[in-house]
Structure formats: C-alpha cells, structure tokens
Amino acid sequence: IKVLGEPTCFSDYIRTSTCEWFLDSAVDCSSQLCLHYRLMFFEFSENLTCIPRNSASTVCVCHMEMNRPVQSDRYQMELWAEHRQLWQGSFSPSGNVKPLAPDNLTLHTNVSDEWLLTWNNLYPSNNLLYKDLISMVNISREDNPAEFIVYNVTYKEPRLSFPINILMSGVYYTARVRVRSQILTGTWSEWSPSITWYNHFQLPLIQR
C-alpha cells in the first residue's frame, strides 16, 4: 500500500480533526491501517490512535477527538499499515480550520416585501468562531441550480434579508449556507442542509 500525496487534515476548532488520504489500491481502512497522533512539545501528551474508515475503496478518513485547540497546538501524526510506516507529518488545528456546517436554516416571511433567512451558528459563545465566522448564502432555482445568487454575509448575525421580487415569481427556490473563519487559515464548511420554498408575489399591474 502507498499513500498518494499528503493526507488532508482539517479541524472543526471545537472537538474533532479529520484527516483523509488517498491510496494506490483498494484497502479495508479499519483493518489494514491506523493513524497515531500526539500533541507535540508537551511532555505528558499521550499517544492516541484513530481507526480509519473507508470513504471510498481507495480513500480512508479518520475522525480524531481532540481537546479544544489553542493556537500553539501541533500534532505529530504517523500512518501505519501493520508494522510499516506509510507517512508521518504534523498538523496544526488552528492553521487548518473547516468549521461545522450551520444548521436549522429557516425562511421567514417578513412584514415588508422581503424574505428573512436565519440559521444557527453551532459554536458556543466562548469559542473563537462564535464571533469570527462569515457566511455565504447560495439561492438557486430548484429546476436549474446553475441559475443562482450568492450573498456574502459580512456581519456576525446569522441572518439575511432579501427582497422577494429579486427572485422570479411562481418558481421553487433552494437556499443553503456555509461559513468560514476569518482570522484562522482554512476552508469553507460543508453546505448546510438546504431548504426549498415556492416564491410567489403579486406582480404590479403594469408587468402582468
């Protein structure tokens, strides 16, 4: 078995880091491989083991439980196949952040001619990401996802108002949201579960 390239690792910056790696042939990840990891520069850190699972026939993924990270945390990692080391490297959770995807995306009808989208930030108020995330909302036609609008939410509150008539009347639309950290290096979260609604409004007489 050979590892193709470097494993890709991300932290959710609260409890879990995830590493994924590609192999040159099909493997049973949980029986053939294991990932050892240990907090570096800390005298009493224990050696921990993650048993990977298959995300595809030649792809393994490991979800590692970690303490809430601090900026200086760095983990030594070693990937083993029985008694043979396939890879070793290090990983800094605060330097590779992929936040938890938002949830509970909800559409509210507003008193004016606007829709209000709200969602939940899954981070507690004592976590850095509680006040560091920016959001991206994608709204697309259900029957043609290539026709979409993107809103960048550049404030702390997990909400977005937009005019009903910016979208076509009599059409089903789908919305989803994702987030990313600003002050930490990393990537966008996965998209939230999407919601779908029927966009209907009365056209002005002149447009009917």
Partner: antibody
Framework: EVQLVESGGGLVQPGGSLRLSCAAS????????MSWVRQAPGKGLEWVSI????????HYAESMKGRFTISRDNAKNTLYLQMNTLKSGDTAVYYC?????????????WGQGTQVTVSS | NFMLTQPSAVSVSLGQTARITCQGG??????ASWYQQKPGQAPVQVIY???NSPSGIPERFSGSSSGDTATLTISGAQAEDEADYYC?????????FGGGTTLTVL
C-alpha cells in the same frame, strides 16, 4: 461615538521595553478584532499585529514576531502592545485600530497614535 | 507572499479626476481598503471591500478592482483631498499596506 486613545509611548533606549495601551469606548469592544499599525517618521503605514475578539488568536508582522506581544482585556475595554528588545528601527507613531467585523474590510476607526522613540 | 505597489506621487488639477493604483494583489481573491492620511493626523478609511464607501466619505471617492490592480478614483478632486493614500489587503494571517501615494491637487 467610537474613541480609541493610545498611551504609553515615550523615549526608550535600544534593547529596552515599552507597553502601549489603547482605551476603547463607544462600541462593543469584545465583538471585534483589534490591531496595531505603526508609521516611522516620513514613511508609510506598517501593520504590526492583530488579535481576535477573545484574545485567543494573534498574528504578527514577521519583523516583530518574538519581540512584540499583543493582548487585550475585554473587561477593561483595553488593547495592549508589549514591545521588548526595541531597536532604533522601531521608532514610529503607533496607532491602535478597530477592525470591521469583516476582517477583509480593514479598519473603520483609528486612534490618534502614540509616539515611540528608540534612541540612546 | 506578495507586495502592494503604489505610485509614489500623483498630481491632479482641481476639479479633475485622480486615479491611484495599487498593484500586486490578487484582487479577485483579496478586497482592497483605502485610507487617506493628512499630515499630523491618523488615517481615515475612504473605501472598504474594494468599492464601498463608509458613511461620511464624499461621493467623489470610489473604488474598483480588476485582476492584480485595485484603483481609487477621486472624481472632481478638491483642495482638501491633498493627502497621502494607502491601499491595504488582508490575507488570512495579517495585513499588507501599499507604500503610499502622495496626491497633489494643482
């Protein structure tokens, strides 16, 4: 009205230390990242450091890593910059700046600055 | 790693349009901020997010970006616009400033 008032500047010998403070008012201090920016005499603006809203994450310009430490006390609405092993090249006006919530938007408010002179 | 490059000086006649460029950033990926600084004063933000103006900034100030260049445009420059102007970007672990441009209004 947002106000940022720097203090703690002065004359210090090379190799010495100084601690700058920035008292903030007029906004919810612990909602925002904060930064220090400096300007040497007759020169342009130079970014020094940034600190996250809760003090957990800090970043520094390369030339200041290991010598400067940014910190904050959210209970006192105050930002700090501890400067050690000062060199003549650190002589500058030091500004405290409030970040927009969106960091890519830069600074919406600046203090008036405090002069730091490193000279024997 | 990249550097932001600005012309050291730009001149404009009173009432004419001044353009100050900032080169070297990937402005498809980075937003530019622009600051005005008058002698002996703290900087003031005149543009954020490449093209947005803070409240209180005259409408003659506008910003745009394309490719590796961000541009600050002052349409109908006034005598009080004479100042130093700096561009700035955030790149996920810190800020970078351009070297600054001195605008002279003739």
């Amino acid at each position: 009205e947002v106000q940022l008032v720097e203090s703690g500047g002065g004359l210090v010998q090379p190799g010495g230390s100084l601690r700058l403070s920035c008292a903030a008012s007029g906004f919810t201090f612990d909602d925002y990242a904060m930064s220090w920016v400096r300007q040497a005499p007759g020169k342009g603006l130079e970014w020094v450091s940034i600190i996250s809203w809760n003090g957990e994450i800090t970043h520094y310009a390369e030339s200041m890593k290991g010598r400067f430490t940014i910190s904050r006390d959210n209970a006192k609405n105050t930002l700090y910059l501890q400067m050690n092993t000062l060199k003549s090249g650190d002589t500058a006006v030091y500004y405290c700046a409030k970040n927009h919530y969106t960091l890519t938007w830069g600074y919406d408010y600046w203090g008036q600055g405090t002069q730091v002179t490193v000279s024997s | 790693n990249f550097m932001l490059t600005q012309p050291s000086a730009v001149s404009v006649s009173l009432g004419q349009t001044a353009r100050i460029t900032c080169q070297g950033g990937n402005f498809g990926r980075y937003y530019a901020s622009w600051y005005q600084q008058k002698p002996g004063q703290a900087p003031v933000q005149v543009i954020y997010g490449s093209s947005n103006s803070p409240s209180g900034i005259p409408e003659r100030f506008s910003g745009s970006s394309s490719g590796d260049t961000a541009t600050l445009t002052i349409s109908g420059a006034q005598a009080e616009d004479e100042a130093d102007y700096y561009c700035q970007v955030w790149d996920s672990s810190g800020y970078k400033f351009g070297g600054g441009t001195t605008l002279t209004v003739l």
